[in-house]
């Protein structure tokens, strides 16, 4: 089939002990080889501190994951979720002030 | 090949301000940060501040902020650094360098001398 | 803003010897965020390790980093003439990004 490119997700979690968890979440892509990774001042974090999810079928013929990291509030302006797919790319920030999610699809 | 290829030598006079290019080749534009950083005549190196090219956000060190600005033209990959109110402890080389996959500065470019004097 | 010590500032060796470079930091850093370059008179500074203890891409087996917390090391196990430069530790941990103030390697 032909490309069809990530709609890209942020969202951060209740903040606990100074920390918040951001996670970055792709969705409705296609093929399902995707680099999907959390980088401060862009550089990407090493693996350690990441999570990431399978790469699954989201039941329309196209593919979903995530990665998660957490951070020190405050901080938040410092990290970008990078995403790689099918020659196409793009950094997504954490969302700032009030707003809990920022989403854009690729094109 | 990646390089990062600056614009030549200024001479400005106290007050005045200028701007240094930086033009990157031989990786996708957008895909790194373009970090900035002087060095002062036989001093150390100092790290001005950086911008995301594919978002346009911009970190600056508090110290430059007042007279610092990052700029970049994506329709000519090509990054920007204007330092205004110009005095004579500005005299450096003025270089950029690209974020790396697994350190903040991993390649540079060749450095561009503005000197300050009246 | 993290300090970063480094010492000594001139150390006077020759070829072939062992050169051992310290980088104090004045506040914790992870060991990912500690980074080594390498400036040679006239040209700019080039990545030599990265997250303490990586060689950078091209860079000779002979260099080596090592340390974590607020001490960090790096050393050249026999000194090549064209390892005759200066040598900044830089911490991405915290901002502002800061380097060192430089050690000197030069020829005894």
């Known amino acids: 089939g032909s490309t069809v490119p990530p709609m890209v997700n942020v969202t951060c979690s209740e903040v606990s002990e100074g920390n918040i968890t951001v996670t970055c979440r792709a969705s409705s892509f296609y093929p399902r080889n995707i680099t999907l990774t959390w980088r401060q001042d862009g550089v990407s974090l090493s693996h350690n501190t990441q999570q990431w999810g399978d790469v699954l079928p989201d039941g329309n013929g196209t593919y979903q994951t995530w990665v998660a990291t957490r951070i020190r509030q405050g901080e938040e302006q410092r990290f970008t979720c990078y995403m790689e797919h099918s020659g196409n790319h793009g950094t997504h920030p954490v969302p700032s002030g009030n707003s809990h999610h920022h989403h854009h699809h690729h094109h | 090949e990646i390089q990062l290829v600056q614009s030549g030598a200024e001479v400005k006079k106290p007050g005045a301000s200028v701007k240094v290019s930086c033009k990157p080749s031989?990786?996708?534009?957008?895909?790194?940060?373009i970090y900035w950083v002087r060095q002062a005549p036989g001093q150390g190196l100092e790290w001005i501040g950086y911008?995301?090219?594919?978002?346009?956000?911009?970190i600056y060190n508090q110290q430059f902020k007042d007279r610092a600005t990052l700029t970049v033209d994506k329709s000519t990959s090509t990054a920007y650094l204007e330092l205004s109110s110009l005095r004579s402890e500005d005299t450096a080389v003025y270089y950029c360098?690209?974020?790396?996959?697994?350190?903040?500065?991993?390649?540079w470019g060749q450095g561009t001398l503005v000197t300050v004097s009246s | 803003e993290i300090v970063l010590t480094q010492s000594p500032a001139t150390l006077s060796l020759s070829p072939g010897e062992r050169a051992t470079l310290s980088c104090s930091a004045s506040?914790?850093?992870?060991?990912?965020?500690l980074h080594w370059y390498q400036q040679k008179p006239g040209q700019a500074p080039r990545l030599l390790i990265y997250?303490?203890?990586n060689l950078a891409s091209g860079i000779p087996a002979r260099f080596s980093g090592s340390g974590s917390g607020t001490d960090f090391t790096l050393t050249i196990s026999s000194l090549e003439p064209e390892d005759f430069a200066v040598y900044y530790c830089?911490?991405?941990?915290?901002?502002?990004?800061?380097f060192g103030q430089g050690t000197k390697v030069e020829i005894k």
């Open positions: 031989g990786y996708a534009f957008t895909s790194n940060n």
């Open positions: 360098s690209r974020s790396g996959e697994r350190s903040n500065f991993d390649y």
């Open positions: 830089q911490q991405g941990g915290s901002l502002p990004l800061t």
């Open positions: 506040s914790s850093i992870s060991s990912n965020y």
């Open positions: 911008i995301d090219p594919y978002i346009g956000r911009i």
């Open positions: 997250r303490t203890s």
